[in-house]
Interface confidence: low
Amino acid sequence: FVRTKIDTTENLLNTEVHSSPAQRWSMQVPPEVSAEAGDAAVLPCTFTHPHRHYDGPLTAIWRAGEPYAGPQVFRCAAARGSELCQTALSLHGRFRLLGNPRRNDLSLRVERLALADDRRYFCRVEFAGDVHDRYESRHGVRLHVTAAPRIVNISVLPSPAHAFRALCTAEGEPPPALAWSGPALGNSLAAVRSPREGHGHLVTAELPALTHDGRYTCTAANSLGRSEASVYLFRFHGASGAST
């Protein structure tokens, strides 16, 4: 109807069987799947193909980043006639097949999610028996990983004219808002969010000039939670110390 999918209805033994002759290859994936860091996510992928009742060897592949060229994160192979797809590659052991490729299902489970897993994934199937054919999703499924804030670095650095500045870097999704508090800063000084180039989940806030000794606290917050870390400035010792 919308494009060139062809669907027919066959009647066998008076039982309605919805059978697609699958005149072409296609893959069905959702645009996006969301999950929290630390949890697991399912990346659904089902497909149709033009080779009815294909029972030969097949390989199921998932890759990340970009179709056709991105690095493989999972690969399994099923022998002729076998419904068992033996895992040959599972990056960091965190990827496992949920679907049955013999039943046109390549759905994948990703365990112990990290923010670095937030990217697009592409499923692929290869037939290698009497039939040699392969197909890969072009658009893929975007895995959106959310995470409560975590402060990954907080430090005091020297700056010109014997002054000091403080840097706080946090990660999270949605990217956290950062605020500094400390001597003469009032309760909370909101810092402009500045996701670092190429590090979409990292945000850095700077206090350009620390004018008083004492404890400076960086707070990172997003809709999933908050995190705090502090540094201590003791200029009369000619040094600074950090504590998290």
Epitope: V2, K5, H18, S20, S26, Q28, P30, V42, N104
Partner: antibody, heavy 122, light 106 residues
Framework: QVQLKQSGAELVRPGTSVQMSCKAV????????IGWVKQRPGHGLEWVGD????????NNNEKFRGKATLTADTSSSTAYMQLRGLTSDDSAIYYC???????????????WGQGTSVTVSS | QIVLSQSPALLSASPGEKVTMTCRAS?????MYWYQQKPGSSPKPWIY???NLTSGVPARFSGSGSGTSYSLTISRVEAEDAATYFC?????????FGGGSKLEIR
């Protein structure tokens, strides 16, 4: 040809639950997603969620979490949506639609049911 | 969530006129999708992936746009085009629809 046949209109009391059905005919039920859409006069269309009967996987609109539960019975090629804790805000027409999440990103709800009208009234 | 704002909410045209309705997204989307709905009927898919007409849609319809601004244009309106047109995005969950543009034929 592809058809989605929805159950009939419902008149229900506030605080109760209702379950509506969507029977798929003319295609392989387990190969496509079924989406549910709410339409209230003056409120346009609202996506409630969708379900893939082949892998029993659901996407939900957070707004309807706790309100709508999506299920599917592959043996009868029927999708179901249950709404609970009904209020007047739930009075609407609810459509099911086949969702074609295709390989090239050309997603579309390509076939729609005729809609189930739900009226919540005491 | 991505909010889709359609304008105008109501437009009136005479047969043969050119009509354009717009859909603005609160943040950038990759594609826009359009559905046609007539009173008492279910929505019908009309345009997918911004500019592709679904099967059976007359060639006088076209879709265009990118980023946050998209439009549906009818080059020469006919009486059968009277309907409400909804835009929709699949870019980010929850998938959302615009409020609709109702086209009346004078």
């Amino acid at each position: 040809q592809v058809q989605l046949k929805q159950s009939g209109a419902e008149l229900v009391r506030p605080g109760t639950s209702v379950q509506m059905s969507c029977k798929a005919v003319g295609y392989t039920f387990t190969n496509y997603w079924i989406g549910w859409v709410k339409q209230r006069p003056g409120h346009g269309l609202e996506w409630v969620g969708d379900i893939h009967p082949g892998i029993n996987y659901t996407n939900n609109n957070e707004k309807f979490r706790g309100k709508a539960t999506l299920t599917a019975d592959t043996s009868s090629s029927t999708a179901y949506m249950q709404l609970r804790g009904l209020t007047s805000d739930d009075s609407a027409i609810y459509y099911c639609a086949r969702v074609d999440y295709d390989y090239d990103g050309s997603y579309i709800m390509d076939y729609w049911g005729q809609g189930t009208s739900v009226t919540v009234s005491s | 969530q991505i909010v889709l704002s359609q304008s105008p909410a109501l437009l009136s045209a005479s047969p043969g006129e050119k009509v354009t309705m717009t859909c603005r997204a609160s943040s950038s989307v990759s594609y826009m999708y359009w559905y046609q709905q007539k009173p008492g009927s279910s929505p019908k898919p009309w345009i997918y992936a911004t500019s592709n007409l679904t099967s059976g849609v007359p060639a006088r319809f076209s879709g265009s746009g990118s980023g946050t601004s998209y439009s549906l244009t009818i080059s020469r309106v006919e009486a059968e085009d009277a309907a409400t047109y909804f835009c929709q995005q699949w870019n980010s969950k929850p998938w959302t629809f615009g409020g609709g543009s109702k086209l009346e034929i004078r």
